[in-house]
């Protein structure tokens, strides 16, 4: 078993919470069985853990909030993996676990005697996980011993039912709004005919199927609809892309309700099948606007359109953030197996030294260069100040007129902290409202995201439009450069005056063969051509009948 | 159906055009490759133009050879002709309309004699 | 660059014989091989496509197989009408090649 899952980053307080974070990449297919994870993660990783660090202290340092309480974190790797997380949230409840027992004098030596061993303080509620599939998992375990979680970035439509995930919370909004903002871009550009692909687990699966139900009732057809993990191998992604190239070029469309890394996938499989440009992606939110999914495929990505979750960058992160050293930084135990990765260079004399870079890391690289905000960190940020207002509540309620922890709220009740959590209301990072519906909800506000290739070898994603409350505004001109540039994704271009659709057997209603109705017939319904009646003609227009005009012959009339 | 036109004998550095006219199905539908063959020696494959309009080539025909397409025609057009291009060139459509799958309808090939 | 690498280059076999001819891809590529048939002034007719499907109208003593990097065309009960060159073709990308076909493999009827 790897040994990096074991490593845990500590800040002391009289309250702790958990933080789980994919500061590494997932488990590729053959290392799965060891629960080995993968290279280390900025955005989705470090710069979580030291969101969660940095934030913790500013809530410490306000007076207002909390008074006489010093929260406390303990975060641990998910590796955006189920069993890791699980793993690591099973670290979090023998926490607990421990004690209470000790609350109640449980601990007891092997030889029987007392211990002096002071345990660590019980975990009150976690923050993350970032995937949907490893939340439901860690929601799972975490309920049993009710500790409320609250989510970042699972957006699963699942984990809006509270009879199943009672301690599950989250300031994002469930994934029906996103594919509804999708269907309502496809409808727009009316593109009848597009194919889907989803990641297998639960974020994909729950948002695809939502996609293809509200496109079902708007009309639109789904060529075929694949899926496919997001750590798949080389071949599974060809395979996928030549089923895709089989519906060419009638369905240009590929909706994506995919993570980013299984875009990412599907980029690098076009370029090895030469089949950049021949697919527009639409992405949802696990795509949104990240850099780490584009890199060096941005050929491939040019013109895909995706969703994104309302959440301006945190320039007090970044003033914190881009500050940061090894030489200081000993809080976070991944910063130095991070900094030797994000500049490819070995920390000479670190404890963390890794032989594998040839390079020393020199004293003038700073994380200025080429810094990308994470894109959920206001989400991230949201979370944590949700949790410290939700104490904050509790104590205000259960500690009136005292400061700090009184006994009334030793130890913390979890089903306590999740009422006074599901009443809170407070002004977020960005200044928007941060409030949860009966399901633990928050409401959606989504920007559209366009990747165009800005100049000679440069791309960039631009805001091209918004979806707030069921209501979408699209710059098209940004999009289009001109009405004739808009793809086409059709299975049939209609018919011509005087001609019916024809739908052949097993075939999806968007796809017909246009057949002319007989030279007696007019054009009942789009699906029917009627006889006229004995005495009657087609109109010009074929869309009726009208009387043949009674001509009487006379004796001398030439034969017509 | 494919058949190919414009073969022809021409002196070395002398541009050539070849036409593939298409009949029966539509060019937006799928790929058309152009190959050649060398008198005596193996098939060749000079380059695709998917039903989108990209184009890819071999990289030894890169620069050389461009393909561009009408509604009904596929055109080949060849620069800087040695004797080593000497071949009867076919066009073939693919089965898909983008990447390279399989070839499925052939012409029957034009002659291009390049000799001083 | 994606290779093709076919042998042997010519093969002699008898009337009702088995011949064996073998393509080598230089990368994995997955299914995607499809052989082909040349008889002298005749364009190539497609026999078999992903590796092992029989294309319309060919006869079932023509076997495709094989996966990955190693793919071969058998012939059983070989017939005079089936002397003739024979192509392997990588169906897999059409980027950065110098070929998509195999040298060809002269089938000799005796």
């Known amino acids: 078993q790897s040994s990096e899952r074991r490593v845990v980053a500590h800040m002391p307080g009289d309250i702790i919470i958990g933080a789980l974070f994919s500061v590494h990449h997932q488990p590729t297919v053959d290392k799965v069985h060891e629960r080995k994870c993968g290279a280390v993660r900025e955005q989705y990783g470090i710069q979580r853990v030291e969101a969660m660090l940095h934030t913790l202290e500013r809530i410490n340092s306000d007076p207002t909030l909390l008074p006489n309480i010093t929260l406390g974190c303990e975060i641990r790797d998910s590796c955006w993996h189920s069993a890791v997380a699980l793993e690591q949230s099973i670290e979090f409840i023998r926490d607990s676990l421990i004690s209470s027992e000790e609350e109640e004098g449980l601990v007891r030596c092997v030889d029987g005697s007392s211990s002096s061993f002071r345990s660590k303080k019980p975990i009150v509620g976690v923050i993350g996980p970032g995937s949907s599939s490893v939340a439901i998992q860690v929601q799972n375990l975490l309920q049993l011993f009710n500790i409320p979680q609250i989510a970042y970035s699972a957006t699963s439509m699942d984990l809006s039912d509270k009879t199943l995930f009672k301690y599950f919370m989250r300031v994002v909004p469930s994934d029906a709004q996103q594919a509804r903002a999708m269907v309502d871009i496809v409808k727009r550009y009316n593109w009848t005919y597009v194919s889907a692909v989803h990641t297998e687990g639960n974020y994909g699966e729950s948002g695809m199927e939502a996609f293809k139900d509200m496109s079902a009732k708007e009309g639109i057809c789904i060529a075929h609809s694949y899926k496919i993990y997001s750590n798949a191998g080389e071949q599974s992604f060809d395979k996928l892309l030549k089923k895709l190239t089989s519906h060419l070029p009638k369905a240009r469309v590929v909706a994506c309700f995919c993570e980013g890394m299984t875009v990412r996938g599907l980029l690098m499989a076009m370029r090895r099948l030469g089949l950049a440009g021949e697919f527009l992606l639409l992405g949802s939110d696990g795509w949104a606007d990240r850099y780490d999914v584009t890199d060096g495929y941005q050929r491939e990505a040019v013109g895909g359109i995706t969703i994104k979750l309302q959440s301006p960058d945190v320039k007090w992160f970044d003033d914190y953030y881009l500050k940061l050293r090894p030489e200081t930084n000993h809080r976070n135990p991944w910063f130095q197996e991070f900094w030797q990765h994000r500049f490819q260079c070995r920390l000479e004399g670190f404890p963390q030294e890794n032989s594998k870079y040839n390079k020393t890391c020199n004293s003038s690289l700073t994380l200025k260069t080429h810094h990308v905000q994470d894109s959920k960190m206001g989400f991230v940020i949201n979370a944590i100040y949700s949790m410290a207002y939700g104490l904050h509540n509790m104590q205000m309620s259960l500690c009136p007129g005292y400061a700090g922890l009184c006994d009334a709220m030793k130890p913390i009740d979890g089903r306590k902290l999740l009422e006074s959590l599901m009443k809170t209301n407070f002004t977020g990072v960005s200044g928007d409202t941060i409030l949860f519906d009966e399901n633990g909800d928050s409401p959606g506000r989504y920007e559209i995201m366009n990747f165009k290739e800005m100049g000679k070898d440069y791309f960039d994603y631009i805001n091209v439009g918004s979806w707030d409350n069921g209501e979408l505004k699209m710059d098209d001109d940004e999009v289009w450069s001109k009405k004739s540039n808009i793809i086409r994704s059709v299975c049939s271009e209609p018919c011509e005056k005087g001609q019916i659709k024809v739908i052949r057997k097993g075939e999806v209603s968007c796809c017909w063969t246009c057949t002319p109705c007989k030279e007696n017939e007019y054009v009942f319904d789009e699906y029917t051509c009627k006889a006229c009646q004995l005495g009657s003609w087609p109109t010009d227009d074929l869309t009726g009948c009208d009387l043949i005009p009674v001509q009487y012959l006379r004796w001398g009339d030439p034969e017509p | 159906s494919v058949e190919e036109s414009g073969g022809r004998l021409v002196t070395p550095g002398t541009p050539l055009t070849l036409t593939c006219t298409v009949s029966g199905f539509s060019l937006n539908n799928y790929a058309m490759n152009w190959i050649r063959q060398a008198p005596g020696k193996g098939l060749e494959w000079i380059g695709i133009i998917y039903g989108s309009g990209s184009t890819y080539y071999a990289s030894w025909a890169k620069g050389r050879f461009t393909a561009s397409k009408t509604s009904t025609t596929v055109d080949l057009k060849m620069t800087s002709l040695t004797t080593e291009d000497t071949a009867t060139y076919f066009c073939?459509?693919?089965?898909?309309?983008?990447?390279?799958?399989?070839?499925?309808?052939w012409g029957q090939g034009t002659l291009v004699t390049v000799s001083s | 660059a994606l290779v093709m690498t076919q042998t042997p280059a010519s093969v002699e076999v008898a009337v009702g014989g088995t011949v064996t001819i073998k393509c080598q891809a230089s990368q994995n590529i997955i299914d995607w091989c499809s052989w082909y048939q040349q008889k002298l002034g005749q364009p190539p007719k497609l026999l078999i496509y992903?590796?092992?499907k029989l294309a319309s109208g060919v006869p079932s003593r023509f076997k495709g197989s094989g996966s990955g990097t190693q793919f071969t065309l058998t012939i059983s009960g070989v017939e005079c009408a089936d002397a003739a060159t024979y192509y392997c073709?990588?169906?897999?990308?059409?980027?950065?090649?110098?070929?998509?076909f195999g040298g060809g493999t002269e089938v000799v009827v005796k």
């Open positions: 073939a459509r693919d089965e898909l309309a983008a990447g390279i799958n399989y070839f499925t309808l």
């Open positions: 992903e590796a092992s």
């Open positions: 073709q990588q169906g897999y990308s059409p980027s950065g090649v110098d070929n998509v």
